[in-house]
Interface confidence: low
């Protein structure tokens, strides 16, 4: 069976989110490299004007989540979590609209990051997303857009 | 059909440099990691490095660190071993292997190898 | 750096199983390491069997199987051939670097 691997993560990037916890990497050298793409995004957006706080505070876990997936415990091979479809669709749409747009329109961005494309993730309440990582975006004032 | 086809070795003086390439052809190497292994004289396998092409990531064994760099031309869907400083326990025979970035098949398939001979 | 040791050779009989073992200086080798088998036949002809411990590279024969035995990582080869007479080399996986091991001379008889 071909799967990848679930390794302890082991950077620095996304550490204060993901500490050492068991992340799935589809090669062994995938990790190093995921970390060097992942940093020179970060910087690039700690430079920006264009990331507001609201987007920030949840945009830079959810990004780190998607690059470094947890491991899915449940499973009896590799496999990694999905992000929760709902908290995608909120932060693209709402709390980090302007920010996405403004993303996916820069090369220079793109070529450092791979952005979380909503449509991919399983919907709520599917057998897949019951595992899904959730990143605690309040849901509440933004509920009527993932319905 | 994959293929690995090293090429550039020959005979160099202590403290000079070198230049291997490894042409791949019957798959795209940005979808892999291409690795060099060489092998001395009756000795055993010894790992030198290896290079993403997808992104140009490298790591090197102590052993050649700061001497040699990997690097690749995604449009000649080729990968290279630039050999600086080089010593007489550098003679060896320097293999291309592949390493799938997707699943877990290290050095699945290998060059047939070019003979680098450091001596003055 | 770590050193990784294997048998210097191992002789068996055609249809004999046989297993050949790959020991870690630094300890028990755990499926952390990776284990990796290359096949190397005359003339310079490596061929990757085995990588991830126990997964089989496309196209190599049912007969050849990865594990760890022990506090080892073996590579088993169960109905030998004569075909599979070879030196085979195993690397272990330490963090950021592969390291091989001197390999095993392997006659099949």
């Known amino acids: 069976e071909e799967d990848g691997f679930c390794q302890p993560y082991r950077g620095i990037a996304c550490a204060r989110f993901i500490g050492n916890r068991t992340v799935y990497m589809e090669s062994l050298h995938m990790q190093g490299e995921i970390e060097n793409q992942i940093t020179a995004a970060f910087t690039m957006i700690g430079t920006s004007s264009h990331l507001s706080d609201k987007c920030s505070q949840f945009a830079i876990p959810s990004l780190c989540h998607y690059a470094f997936p947890y491991c899915d415990e449940t499973s009896s091979v590799p496999k990694p979590r999905d992000l929760c479809r709902d908290e995608c669709e909120i932060l693209e749409n709402v709390l980090c609209q302007t920010e996405y747009i403004f993303a996916r329109s820069n090369p220079m961005i793109l070529m450092r990051l791979k952005l979380p494309n909503c449509e991919d993730l399983p919907q709520p309440e599917s057998p897949e997303a019951a595992n899904c990582i959730r990143i605690g975006i309040p849901m509440a004032d933004h509920h009527h857009h993932h319905h | 059909e994959v293929q690995l086809v090293e090429s550039g070795g020959g005979l160099a003086q202590p403290g000079g440099s070198l230049r291997l390439s490894c042409a791949a052809s019957?798959?795209?190497?940005?979808?892999?990691?291409i690795h060099w292994v060489r092998q001395a004289p009756g000795k055993g396998l010894e790992w030198v490095g290896y290079?993403?092409?997808?992104?140009?990531?490298?790591h090197y064994a102590d052993s050649v660190k700061g001497r040699f760099t990997i690097s690749a031309d995604t449009s000649k869907n080729t990968a290279y071993l630039q050999m600086n400083s080089l010593r007489a326990e550098d003679t060896a025979v320097y293999y291309c292997?592949?390493?799938?970035?997707?699943?877990?098949?290290?050095?699945?398939?290998w060059g047939q190898g070019t003979l680098v001979t450091v001596s003055s | 750096q770590a050193v990784v040791t294997q048998e210097s050779a191992l002789t068996t009989s055609p249809g004999e199983t046989v297993t050949l073992t790959c020991r870690s200086s630094?300890?028990?080798?755990?499926?952390?390491?990776?284990a990796n088998w290359v096949q190397e036949k005359p003339d310079h002809l490596f061929t990757g069997l085995i990588g991830?411990?126990?997964k089989r590279a496309p196209g190599v024969p049912a007969r050849f199987s990865g594990s760890l035995i022990g506090d080892k990582a073996a590579l088993t080869i169960t109905g030998a051939q004569t075909e599979d007479e070879a030196i085979y080399f195993c690397?272990?996986?330490?963090?950021?670097?592969?390291?091989f091991g001197g390999g095993t001379k392997l006659t099949v008889l």
């Open positions: 292997a592949r390493d799938s970035r997707r699943y877990v098949r290290p050095f699945d398939y």
């Open positions: 019957g798959f795209n190497i940005t979808g892999y990691y």
């Open positions: 290079i993403s092409p997808n992104s140009g990531a490298t």
């Open positions: 630094t300890g028990a080798v755990t499926t952390s390491n990776y």
């Open positions: 991830g411990t126990n």
């Open positions: 690397a272990l996986w330490y963090s950021n670097l592969w390291v």
